[in-house]
């Protein structure tokens, strides 16, 4: 659980109790079982621009 009173993690990141900080969801590529990856899976991905009209 994130400590009460702390700012929520920014979009594309998730709280890690193991590390006691917000972690970039891209890091789940290196270690998919990291504790913060559960939060990344639950959140929708950041929007992206289509490469075609």
């Amino acid at each position: 659980e994130q400590a009460p009173g702390t700012a929520p993690c920014s979009r594309g990141s998730s709280w890690s109790a193991d590390l006691d900080k917000c972690m970039d969801c891209a890091s789940c590529r290196a270690r998919p079982h990291s504790d913060f990856c559960l939060g990344c899976a639950a959140a929708p991905p950041a929007p992206f621009r289509l490469l075609w009209p």
Partner: antibody, heavy 120, light 112 residues
Framework: QVQLVQSGAEVKKPGASVKVSCKAS????????IAWVKQAPGQGLEWIGE????????YYSEKFRGKATLTADTSTSTAYMELSSLRSEDTAVYFC?????????????WGQGTLVTVSS | DIVMTQSPLSLPVTPGEPASISCRSS???????????LYWYLQKPGQSPQLLIY???NRASGVPDRFSGSGSGTDFTLKISRVEAEDVGVYYC?????????FGQGTKVEIK
């Protein structure tokens, strides 16, 4: 450069305990996991557990729960593994290894190993 | 726990010739992100293990391009295109999909 330097070889009697150290340098100690791996004589590699040094949170293999205790001292950038109630089957080389958590995968770094011999 | 099984356990090789080692996992190492979490390590005599290949096919920093990894799901292969004398040692496959971290039994590569 990243370095993990382990303590020297130990000879212990059955029933005793031993504490192996792993001193890290060349990176921010609290940003990476330290894992511990056992290699019995002539055998393969066996994961014991790992610790997040910044928070002290630990994960253990079921086989080593109650046998190994992992701790870390952030003031000296040193991780420790204590093995209790030693038996002959605990005779092995024990390695510490830094494991990455980050997207920019920069590989694992291993200590040189510490030989623990349990003999009466 | 994921069980990793290697073959062969012993591999006599001739310098300059190719060699390959197989590794099978008891469950798929292919994550929903389309990455195979299979790793290869080499432990040279009297040394610590060193990472050769991560995520099935990516060479670790400083690893010669004669080493390559391939496969998918549960079946993986490490290939050495031309074996050199310095390649002797025990090769281990391992996964990084979940805890516990498990390794294959090891394949001992030695010069004929």
């Amino acid at each position: 450069q990243v370095q993990l330097v382990q303590s020297g070889a130990e000879v212990k009697k059955p029933g005793a305990s031993v504490k192996v150290s792993c001193k890290a340098s060349g990176y921010t100690f609290t940003d990476f996991i330290i894992a511990w791996v056992k290699q019995a004589p002539g055998q393969g590699l066996e994961w014991i557990g790992e610790i997040y040094p910044g928070t002290g949170r630990t994960y253990y293999s079921e086989k080593f729960r109650g046998k190994a205790t992992l701790t870390a001292d952030t003031s000296t950038s040193t991780a420790y593994m204590e093995l209790s109630s030693l038996r002959s089957e605990d005779t092995a080389v024990y390695f510490c290894a830094r494991r990455t958590i980050y997207y920019d995968y920069d590989g694992d770094y291993w200590g040189q190993g510490t030989l623990v011999t349990v003999s009466s | 726990d994921i069980v990793m099984t290697q073959s062969p356990l012993s591999l006599p090789v001739t310098p300059g010739e190719p060699a390959s080692i197989s590794c099978r996992s008891s469950q798929s190492l292919l994550h929903s992100n389309w990455i195979n979490y299979l790793y290869w390590y080499l432990q040279k005599p009297g040394q610590s293990p060193q990472l050769l290949i991560y995520q099935m096919s990516n060479r670790a920093s400083g690893v010669p391009d004669r080493f390559s990894g391939s496969g998918s799901g549960t079946d993986f292969t490490l290939k050495i295109s031309r074996v050199e004398a310095e390649d002797v040692g025990v090769y281990y496959c391992a996964h990084n999909l979940e805890l516990p971290w498990t390794f294959g039994q090891g394949t001992k590569v030695e010069i004929k």
